[in-house]
Amino acid sequence: KAMHVAQPAVVLANSRGTASFVCEYASPGKATEVRVTVLRQADSQVTEVCAATYMMGNELTFLDDSICTGTSSGNQVNLTIQGLRAMDTGLYICKVELMYPPPYYMGIGNGTQIYVIDPEPCPDSD
């Protein structure tokens, strides 16, 4: 059976511009090293938002300047994307790659549509 990656269809970012969703995969092999990449698709353009490689049972580590954080539990990854603005609204796709030991496998989710609404500015208090 092909590696299946599941993620929610829609998520609404909170007022601070933070969105969280779960990326879950059905693994065809017993991987010890997994790479998770979040890709944003908008207007047929695909850009990489963030990526992390982790050892099964260990914490997910993104680069220091990444807008993503995450935790892992078995075949489930809890992803959080921060600093989002209305212009960042789009389809966020979870890609999972089983890197080690061989064989390599790849699975790609259908994407999570993240809606971001910029907060209304506070009215002046004179």
Epitope: K1, A2, K95, P103, M106, I108
Partner: antibody
Framework: QVQLVESGGGVVQPGRSLRLSCAAS????????MHWVRQAPGKGLEWVAV????????YYADSVKGRFTISRDDSKNTLYLQMSSLRAEDTAVYYC????????????????WGQGTLVTVSS | DIQMTQSPSSLSASVGDRVTITCRAS??????LNWYQQKPGKAPKLLIY???SLQSGVPSRFSGSGSGTDFTLTISSLQPEDFATYYC?????????FGPGTKVDIK
């Protein structure tokens, strides 16, 4: 334009070693995964090995595992295939091919190929 | 390893014919399938990737379809330059195996 030029092929005796090179130009070499694919005379294509764009991962066909090593030198825009313990069945044209690796929503695919270099293993 | 099979192994066709080549994987590979064309003495050329995406510069008479285990390459109207051997390849899991090829020659 994208160019891949293989070199290093030739006639070699069984059990000996050979190193193939693939010189790349016309694109940002360090942003692409690279593959070696071979084709025995009159036969079909056989995938040999891949190296990730940053050199972090390498994968091999079972038929060459433990005997062949794929590597890259991004400062020279060159891909290598070190072949040891060569056998008659390794006789083939060896192609290098590039594979887009960044922000890919598809499986990997070889979009540009070199013209190949012939390796003949014979006593 | 995932095994790839192709049918037919060879076919004879005329210019203008509609040609269909099938590729089957030994297990589900989702849509991670590529098609290549190779002419004698030449390097392979990418036609289709991800089962149905047409590579830039490839004529629109080539199309691909399928997912899971069964895939098809169709040439809607065969042209003289299309006589060649066609290979499918899976890129779901290493080793990225090729099918044995389908040779298309002139009837």
């Amino acid at each position: 334009q994208v160019q891949l030029v293989e070199s290093g092929g030739g006639v070699v005796q069984p059990g000996r070693s050979l190193r193939l090179s693939c010189a790349a130009s016309g694109f940002t070499f360090s942003s692409y995964g690279m593959h070696w694919v071979r084709q025995a005379p009159g036969k079909g294509l056989e995938w040999v090995a891949v190296i990730w764009y940053d050199g972090s991962y390498k994968y091999y066909a079972d038929s060459v595992k433990g005997r062949f090593t794929i590597s890259r030198d991004d400062s020279k825009n060159t891909l290598y295939l070190q072949m040891s313990s060569l056998r008659a069945e390794d006789t083939a044209v060896y192609y290098c091919a590039r594979a887009p690796h960044y922000a890919i929503l598809t499986g990997y695919y070889e979009d540009y190929w070199g013209q190949g270099t012939l390796v003949t293993v014979s006593s | 390893d995932i095994q790839m099979t192709q049918s037919p192994s060879s076919l004879s066709a005329s210019v203008g014919d509609r040609v269909t080549i099938t590729c089957r994987a030994s297990q589900s590979i989702s849509s991670y399938l590529n098609w290549y064309q190779q002419k004698p003495g030449k390097a392979p050329k990418l036609l289709i990737y991800a089962a149905s995406s047409l590579q830039s510069g490839v004529p629109s008479r080539f199309s691909g379809s399928g997912s899971g285990t069964d895939f098809t390459l169709t040439i809607s109207s065969l042209q003289p330059e299309d006589f060649a051997t066609y290979y499918c390849q899976q890129s779901y899991s290493t080793p990225f195996t090729f099918g044995p090829g389908t040779k298309v020659d002139i009837k």
